[in-house]
């Protein structure tokens, strides 16, 4: 007997062919011998089956000796053996209908779990294999689970259900709600304005929720809330902001914060959390601020950085257009009795300059100038 696999909600066409290439009488019945449909001359007739309003055939094919049974909006319970009676012959087709659904909403927060559940007819023993948008394969039976969803898991998941050497493919669109970057680092000279941006990695019609930026300054013993805000239909409104520093926030997406001045006491790490309406859990983005200061005190030229720098970074002091006088993996370097000229303080990663501050050293009888 022929096996046909169908997808819940789809349409299936079961074929039945007579040896005579002309319109003759045929009937489609289910395994309980209940008539589904047939013909009387050129008219389509329907029986008392549950499929009544969803069953159809193609009259245009009858003259060629083809009498298909079309079932629309398939349901799992449509799984059955269908019998086509034509020319004193019986053709049996076993239809197996499967459904694959995501356990919850298909919009999931980064870090959450995705569970795909297979609906299958009794007596079937299918296997399922799903391929994520980033090419990761997962296998399972009735349920498949993916924990700790990542941003790269956003997109179309392709799942193949295998039964009796036949397969049917499902496509499920998953949206992982996350910030574009899990972490970012901003390098600034002391006194410069700081811009923090938190772009989202997804677009939705309406976006409503609330958020907060907690800041752990390197010099502080505990973290503090710098700003809280609400998000209503993509419009941002500030609820509460600290007096020091006095952050400013953009009114539209992407979420955007401005710190008027980069100061050593602000250097550190922040965590922006965003709670979305009707979602359990929060989106997170880490942001880091590194601040550089170059100073000259009497005969000592010093360069310092504050904030979360990697132990890979090199801090250097050099006279413009000359080799570095000092270049160390430290957060402070200095030169005693620096010669007059424009000195550069450089924070670099294997030659890539991340932050630069210039300080003019005047001949010993003058005061230094900070451009």
């Amino acid at each position: 007997k022929k096996v046909v696999l169908g997808k819940k909600g789809d349409t299936v066409e079961l074929t039945c062919t007579a040896s005579q290439k002309k319109s003759i009488q045929f009937h489609w019945k289910n395994s309980n011998q209940i008539k589904i449909l047939g013909n009387q001359g050129s008219f389509l007739t329907k029986g008392p089956s549950k499929l009544n309003d969803r069953a159809d055939s193609r009259r245009s094919l009858w003259d060629q000796g083809n009498f298909p049974l079309i079932i629309k909006n398939l349901k799992i319970e449509d799984s059955d053996t269908y019998i086509c009676e034509v020319e004193d012959q019986k053709e049996e087709v076993q239809l197996l209908v499967f459904g694959l659904t995501a356990n919850s909403d298909t919009h999931l927060l980064q870090g959450q779990s995705l569970t795909l559940t297979l609906e299958s007819p009794p007596g079937s023993s299918p296997s399922v294999q799903c391929r994520s948008p980033r090419g990761k394969n997962i296998q399972g039976g009735k349920t498949l689970s993916v924990s700790q969803l990542e941003l790269q898991d956003s997109g179309t998941w392709t799942c193949t259900v295998l039964q009796n050497q036949k397969k049917v493919e499902f496509k499920i669109d998953i949206v992982v709600l996350a910030f574009q970057k899990a972490s970012s680092i901003v390098y600034k000279k002391e006194g410069e304005q700081v811009e923090f941006s938190f772009p989202l990695a997804f677009t939705v019609e309406k976006l409503t929720g609330s958020g907060e930026l907690w800041w752990q300054a390197e010099r502080a013993s505990s973290s503090k809330s710098w700003i809280t805000f609400d998000l209503k239909n993509k419009e941002v409104s500030v609820k509460r902001v600290t007096q020091d520093p006095k952050l400013q926030m953009g009114k539209k997406l992407p979420l955007h914060l401005t710190l008027p001045q980069a100061l050593p006491q602000y250097a550190g790490s922040g965590n922006l959390t965003l709670a979305l309406e009707a979602k359990t859990g929060k989106l997170h983005q880490e942001v880091n601020l590194v601040v550089m200061r170059a100073t000259q005190l009497q005969k000592n030229l010093t360069c310092e950085v504050w904030g979360p720098t990697s132990p890979k970074l090199m801090l250097s002091l050099k006279l413009e257009n000359k080799e570095a006088k000092v270049s160390k993996r430290e957060k402070a370097v200095w030169v005693l009795n620096p010669e007059a000229g424009m000195w550069q303080c450089l924070l670099s990663d294997s030659g890539q300059v991340l932050l630069e501050s210039n300080i003019k050293v005047l001949p010993t009888w003058s005061t230094p100038v900070q451009p």
Partner: antibody, heavy 119, light 113 residues
């Protein structure tokens, strides 16, 4: 696993230049600095300089300043070291090396390129 | 510039015995900011590029046998091979990467007695 594959041996005349290539395969090229280290026959290791392929930023050892140029081509994942005004004491095996763990201890090395400077 | 000095220049040790190589830097390679010693040890066999054994003065590179260990801090460092094997015959180098220029020691040749 990342591999660094260097160009073949070179024989050069004093006063000329040599350009050695180092091609990275099996990983992201621009994420980590590529250093050049040389070793004269029977001698120790000598760091010449490095390049950050991401920015093209370089640092050279004072000894080679003005004679060495390190470049990188991201499109081909290749780093180059050019040494000019060659002299007989530049005869050495030249290695490219990469630190892929986030410090500058070199965990991946090229196989080495022998450069012979002889009149 | 930091100068690295190794001792001894060559060393002969019996199979199964302990081998110890010392390395001294002219300045401290311990970063007070990051509390890390920027010192590595390499093994080089004839006709081969060097192979990283130890980084951060005492962290063993993956795949390196546990008979190799590194110790020390500031300016004085030691590479120890607890039980010498035939395949350990090589030249060993220490390297500082605390400041530019990066510098290597002159090397220690290890042989079997």
């Amino acid at each position: 696993q990342v591999q660094l594959v260097q160009s073949g041996a070179e024989v050069k005349k004093p006063g000329s230049s040599v350009k050695v290539s180092c091609k990275a395969s099996g990983g992201t090229f621009s994420s980590y600095a590529i250093s050049w280290v040389r070793q004269a026959p029977g001698q120790g290791l000598e760091w010449m300089g490095w390049i950050n392929p991401n920015s093209g930023g370089t640092n050279y050892a004072q000894k080679f300043q003005g004679r060495v140029t390190i470049t990188a081509d991201e499109s081909t994942s290749t780093a180059y070291m050019e040494l000019s005004s060659l002299r007989s004491e530049d005869t050495a095996v030249y290695y490219c090396a990469r630190a892929s763990r986030g410090d500058d201890a070199f965990d991946i090395w090229g196989q080495g390129t022998t450069v012979t400077v002889s009149s | 510039d930091i100068v690295m000095t190794q001792s001894p220049d060559s060393l002969a040790v019996s199979l199964g015995e302990r081998a110890t190589i010392n390395c001294k830097s002219s300045q401290s390679v311990l970063s007070s900011s990051y509390n890390k010693n920027y010192l590595a040890w390499y093994q080089q066999k004839p006709g081969q590029p060097p192979k990283l054994l130890i980084y951060w003065a005492s962290a063993r590179e993956s795949g390196v046998p546990d008979r190799f260990s590194g110790s020390g801090s500031g300016t004085d460092f030691t590479l120890t091979i607890s039980s010498l094997q035939a395949e350990d015959v090589a030249v060993y180098y220490c390297q500082q990467y605390y400041s530019i220029p990066i510098a290597f020691g002159q090397g220690t040749r290890l042989e079997i007695k």
